[in-house]
């Protein structure tokens, strides 16, 4: 969490941002809140990015003001217009690009004063893994697949019964570049699995950590997946 304070002749206002991550090709949100004002027409929101000449986005007098917007953000940014009045200056970013990563500043002017806070935005790709029994294999085998990751993640297998065991000798992981030549499909195979055990396939890079669990018994197969972003620090 980053909390910034204004430093101007007028009073300073508190602006709060949260570091976050964007999944390339999907929509993202850069979070920013501020002390609200009672009049929308008195609020100015400016989003800036380190190293970028033009503005990322400007919202003033209740509407977008995009004459100074940088080309790289054209057509891709919006604030939550109906929530500005309650202090939400968060930015929607359409179709997140790898190059959107960097340091952003959320700068606010209201009738009470000015304030700003920085935000670190990471970009990459992350997706939920799915673990299945590979019936085509000669021995009892599990296959863990996740369609989109970037940067290249690590894959670790674990089991409930053999806690702390190292499965690297009995697993094989491959990374296949997807058609857009950035993200990769992750496939990991675990051999010699036993029934009545829960196995977990854990995929992690510096942006996200995802786990796919599978429990195989004589009578049924239970699956569960979970994904967690790693860098949600507030400022």
């Amino acid at each position: 969490l980053i909390i910034g304070f204004g430093i101007s002749g007028r009073h300073s206002i508190t602006v709060t941002t949260v570091a976050s991550a964007g999944n390339i090709g999907e929509d993202g949100i850069l979070s920013c809140t501020f002390e609200p004002d009672i009049k929308l027409s008195d609020i100015v929101i400016q989003w800036l990015k380190e190293g970028v000449l033009g503005l990322v986005h400007e919202f003033k007098e209740g509407k977008d003001e995009l004459s100074e917007q940088d080309e790289m953000f054209r057509g891709r940014t919006a604030v939550f217009a109906d929530q500005v009045i309650v202090g939400n200056a968060s930015l929607r970013l359409k179709n997140v690009q790898l190059t959107d990563a960097g340091t952003y500043k959320c700068y606010i002017i209201t009738s009470k004063g000015k304030g700003n806070a920085n935000l670190e935005y990471k970009t990459g790709a992350f997706s939920m893994p799915e673990v299945n029994v590979d019936y085509n294999a000669s021995s009892e085998t599990l296959r863990c697949e996740a369609p989109r990751w970037f940067p290249q993640p690590t894959v670790v297998w674990a089991s409930q019964v053999d806690q702390g065991a190292n499965f690297s000798e009995v697993s094989n992981t491959s990374f296949e570049l997807n058609s857009e030549n950035v993200t990769m499909k992750v496939v990991s195979v675990l051999y010699n699995v036993t029934i009545n055990n829960t196995y977990s396939c854990m995929i992690e890079n510096d942006i996200a950590k995802a786990t796919g669990d599978i429990k195989v018994t004589e009578s049924e197969i239970k699956r569960r997946s979970h994904l967690q972003l790693l860098n949600s620090k507030a400022s």
Partner: antibody, heavy 121, light 107 residues
Framework: QVQLQQSGAELMKPGASVKMSCKAT????????IEWVKQRPGHGLEWIGE????????TYNAKFKVKATFTADTSSNTAYMQLSSLTSEDSAVYFC??????????????WGQGTSLTVSS | QAVVTQESALTTSPGDTVTLTCRSS?????????ANWVQEKPDHLFTGLIG???NRVPGVPARFSGSLIGDKAALTITGAQTEDEAMYFC?????????FGGGTKLE
């Protein structure tokens, strides 16, 4: 006023490729997304994908990722969609539409008149 | 992929109020689905009506309004007119793709 003018009907052979166009007039072409939509009788509307003119930014419906390719030429304010390896399943009317993404709303507003594609041997 | 469901047909009379709905197979429709409503008249004449759940496209008559009703997106025509007889499609955004409903024929 805003207009999206699409190219004329096409009759193509299976296996061929076709490139259809959507010429935009009356607005700043590079500030709006161009969406491509497929309409087949009994199948409703299917979103193919979108392009932001003046950038290389595109989004494709997974189903059409191999089939469709979008390009846009900002000098002529024209968006293009190429469909490859045509089959009878590709016979349809294809529309381009303008999509506005902004703080106050997100909407499809203007649509082209459609390009009819027939794939037949 | 999500499935978006609309009433296949509705009948109304001039002056009446009619509501068309749009349901998502993935759960409740929210403002993050940016619900859009599009009208199709004969000869493939499409016009955008509503975007972002409840914002009228500029130039669209005030009798058209969008909202969320329960877990669905809705298009309400207050005081329907004969020229409103058409096909109405909703479209929902799912983070990186649009899905259209099957359309409602309004008679």
């Amino acid at each position: 006023q805003v207009q999206l003018q699409q190219s004329g009907a096409e009759l193509m052979k299976p296996g061929a490729s076709v490139k259809m166009s959507c010429k935009a007039t009356g607005y700043t072409f590079s500030s709006y997304w161009i969406e491509w939509v497929k309409q087949r009788p009994g199948h409703g509307l299917e979103w193919i994908g979108e392009i932001l003119p003046g950038t290389s930014i595109t989004t494709y419906n997974a189903k059409f990722k191999v089939k469709a390719t979008f390009t846009a030429d900002t000098s002529s304010n024209t968006a293009y969609m190429q469909l490859s390896s045509l089959t009878s399943e590709d016979s349809a009317v294809y529309f381009c539409a303008r999509y506005y993404f902004g703080s106050s709303s997100f909407y499809f507003d203007y649509w082209g008149q459609g390009t009819s594609l027939t794939v037949s041997s | 992929q999500a499935v978006v469901t609309q009433e296949s047909a509705l009948t109304t009379s001039p002056g009446d109020t009619v509501t068309l709905t749009c349901r998502s197979s993935t759960g409740a429709v929210t403002t993050s689905n940016y619900a859009n409503w599009v009208q199709e008249k004969p000869d493939h004449l499409f016009t955008g009506l509503i975007g972002g759940t409840n914002n009228r496209v500029p130039g669209v008559p005030a009798r058209f309004s969008g909202s969320l009703i329960g877990d669905k997106a809705a298009l309400t025509i207050t005081g329907a007119q004969t020229e409103d007889e058409a096909m109405y499609f909703c479209a929902l955004w799912y983070n990186n793709h649009w899905v259209f409903g099957g359309g409602t024929k309004l008679e």
